[in-house]
Interface confidence: low
């Protein structure tokens, strides 16, 4: 069984369109993914955070499209340390319909740079590490084009990034890695 | 009202050097993201850098990466381009942009609002 929480970027480093393409990218996967035993949750973030859907949510309308729609973009700074503490303590909470037992899955979308963050990595990574969630990050548009921003894409996902971090240049790019994304869950679900 | 006003261009031979400047007005510059963007003749427009409101963070178009840096004053409300090693392609009018919304850190032209009137940059032996 897997518990998978999105978290995406919605900052204004994320260009309309790429947000756009971001959202077919999660309704997509999280069809490709639709098992009876997986659920899925998403949290914006920015410099504010938004919980669209929870496990629990989703568990009662395992509608994809329908949850992910009515998502609009925040726009603003991009603190991710802060949303990927937020996911790690929020989404991951029984309260909020997390399993036990089950694999904690983090895909995590966005543009690279953090930015006005009061978190760093450092903050935040030992602790998804202890609570056992495996990270995979997407950098979209601008992720893929700095050194900095590919090194930061290292620090928030998984050990090795070669198996964990995907990067694109443009929304429609995304496309291209659903499939593989897909096989990679699969696999750690056996 | 807003106003941009380039500084800086000139004529320069291959593998020179200019510096850019943009004095801001009318407007919190410190709180703006902050744009160079280039019109080479007859073609579009097209972006070359930007810096966050603060100065921490900065973009670079692939065709200048690793040439020319941004950078920003904020006490003097003052955006600077400096441009090392220049190529004939170089060859363009510059101008530099202010994001519309305060705070965010924007580089799609669409998200730019004003404008100045450029500084013509021409690079030839």
């Known amino acids: 069984d897997s518990d998978i929480a999105f978290l995406i970027d919605g900052s204004g480093s994320i260009i309309p369109h790429d947000f756009r393409r971001m959202k077919e990218f999660v309704s997509t996967v999280m069809e490709q993914l639709k098992k009876s035993k997986t659920l899925f949750s998403l949290m914006q973030y920015s410099e504010e955070f938004r919980i669209h859907f929870t496990f629990k949510e989703f568990q009662n309308n395992p509608n994809p499209r329908s949850l992910v729609k009515p998502i609009t973009q925040l726009l603003g700074r991009t603190h991710t340390a802060t949303g990927i503490r937020k996911v790690v303590r929020e989404l991951f909470n029984i309260t909020n319909g997390a399993r036990k037992n089950a694999f904690k899955i983090l895909v995590v979308i966005t543009a690279g740079e953090k930015f006005g963050d009061p978190l760093g990595y450092e903050d935040v990574i030992p602790e998804a590490d202890r609570e056992g969630v495996i990270r995979y990050v997407i950098g979209v548009g601008d992720a893929s084009r700095s050194e900095k921003s590919r090194q930061e894409l290292n620090t928030i996902a998984s050990k090795p990034p070669r198996d964990h971090v995907f990067q694109v240049n443009n929304g429609e790019a995304l496309k291209t890695i659903q499939n593989q994304l897909r096989e990679k869950i699969f696999a750690i679900e056996g | 009202d807003v106003q941009l006003v380039e500084s800086g261009g000139g004529l320069v031979q291959p593998g020179g050097s200019l510096r850019l400047s943009c004095t801001a007005s009318?407007?919190?510059?410190?709180?703006?993201?902050m744009n160079w963007v280039r019109q080479a003749p007859g073609k579009g427009l097209e972006w070359v850098s930007v810096i966050s409101s603060s100065g921490s963070r900065r973009n670079y178009a692939d065709s200048v990466k690793g040439r020319f840096t941004i950078s920003r004053d904020n006490a003097k409300s003052t955006l600077y381009l400096q441009m090392n090693s220049l190529k004939p392609e170089d060859t363009a009018v510059y101008y530099c942009?202010?994001?519309?919304?305060?705070?965010?850190?924007?580089?799609?032209?669409?998200?730019?609002?004003?404008r100045g009137q450029g500084t013509q940059v021409t690079v030839s032996s």
């Open positions: 942009a202010k994001v519309r919304d305060a705070g965010y850190y924007r580089w799609n032209l669409n998200d730019l609002d004003y």
């Open positions: 009318g407007f919190t510059f410190s709180n703006y993201a």
